[in-house]
């Protein structure tokens, strides 16, 4: 199946919050929206 990137983003934000509260770590934002077409073998430009 395909990966739901919105779920990945939600999960990442949860881990980011946990890292800040438990380990005093700051994780900068990452973009998960700049992804290729999920069903394509065609490479990006």
């Amino acid at each position: 199946g395909t990966i739901n990137v919105h779920d990945v983003e939600t999960q990442f934000n949860q881990y980011k919050t946990e890292a800040a509260s438990r380990y005093n770590l700051t994780i900068s934002d990452v973009s998960v929206s700049d992804v290729p077409f999920p069903f394509s073998a065609q490479s990006g430009a």
């Epitope: 199946g1 990137v5 700049d34 992804v35 990006g44």
Partner: antibody, heavy 121, light 111 residues
């Protein structure tokens, strides 16, 4: 309000060039893949180009590959379509459209009003 | 390329009755439990508007009289009861692979 507004259309001779622009507002432009879709005088809808949210991945149908270039400026909330080596069959209404869906490339959920491109000598 | 066929170019339906618009893909557009077929409405002089996505999901703000069904290669858009404002051309479109392609459209006339 979520809005897309195209500009840059006009009359151009065969073999000529034209650059279309699409100004986006009312949503986080940098979070969405964007596309150009055209509608021929016969009312047929044709996908023209797609660019990922950050501009890394770009896709075209064979009919425009090598002639059209899609690009975006996320700082300016603007999508572009550079068209060259234009042919009569490129005559159409050109729509800017946002791609929505869980995997970012599923359906066109927001459309602009369109800009007309006419290729004729 | 996946060819999308809307076999009925125009359809006349009486006010208050049911309109059924069909769409067929040349190969399956379904995978992993999802059907990558979508429906758009286009009124004269306006851009297309998303009605139904992933075969059966109603887009926000679209009246509940619109519904979509189907999987694999055969899909249907139903409008019931039909209202005057539904006079438009309806297009289906797949996103199962590149290139994305659209059906030729079905023009709905309200009698």
């Amino acid at each position: 309000e979520v809005q897309l507004e195209e500009s840059g259309g006009g009359l151009v001779k065969p073999g000529g060039s034209l650059k279309l622009s699409c100004a986006a507002s009312g949503f986080t432009f940098s979070g969405y893949a964007m596309s150009w879709v055209r509608q021929t005088p016969e009312k047929r809808l044709e996908w023209v180009a797609t660019i990922s949210s950050g501009g890394t991945y770009i896709y075209y149908p064979d009919s425009v590959k090598g002639r059209f270039t899609i690009s975006r400026d996320n700082a300016k909330n603007t999508l572009y379509l550079q068209m060259s080596s234009l042919r009569s069959e490129d005559t159409a209404m050109y729509y800017c459209a946002r791609l929505g869906g869980d995997n970012y490339y599923e359906y066109f959920d927001v459309w602009g009003a369109g800009t007309t491109v006419t290729v004729s000598s | 390329d996946i060819v999308i066929t809307q076999s009925t170019a125009s359809l006349g339906v009486s006010l208050g009755q049911r309109a059924t618009i069909s769409c067929r893909a040349s190969k399956s557009v379904s995978t992993s439990g999802y059907s990558y077929m979508h429906w758009y409405q286009q009124r004269p002089g306006q851009p297309p508007k998303l009605l139904i996505y992933l075969a059966s999901n109603l887009e926000s703000g679209v009246p509940a009289r619109f519904s979509g069904s189907g999987s694999g290669t055969d899909f249907t858009l139903n409008i019931h009861p039909v209202e005057e404002e539904d006079a438009a051309t309806y297009y289906c479109q797949h996103s199962r692979e590149l290139p994305f392609t659209f059906g030729g459209g079905t023009k709905l006339e309200i009698k």
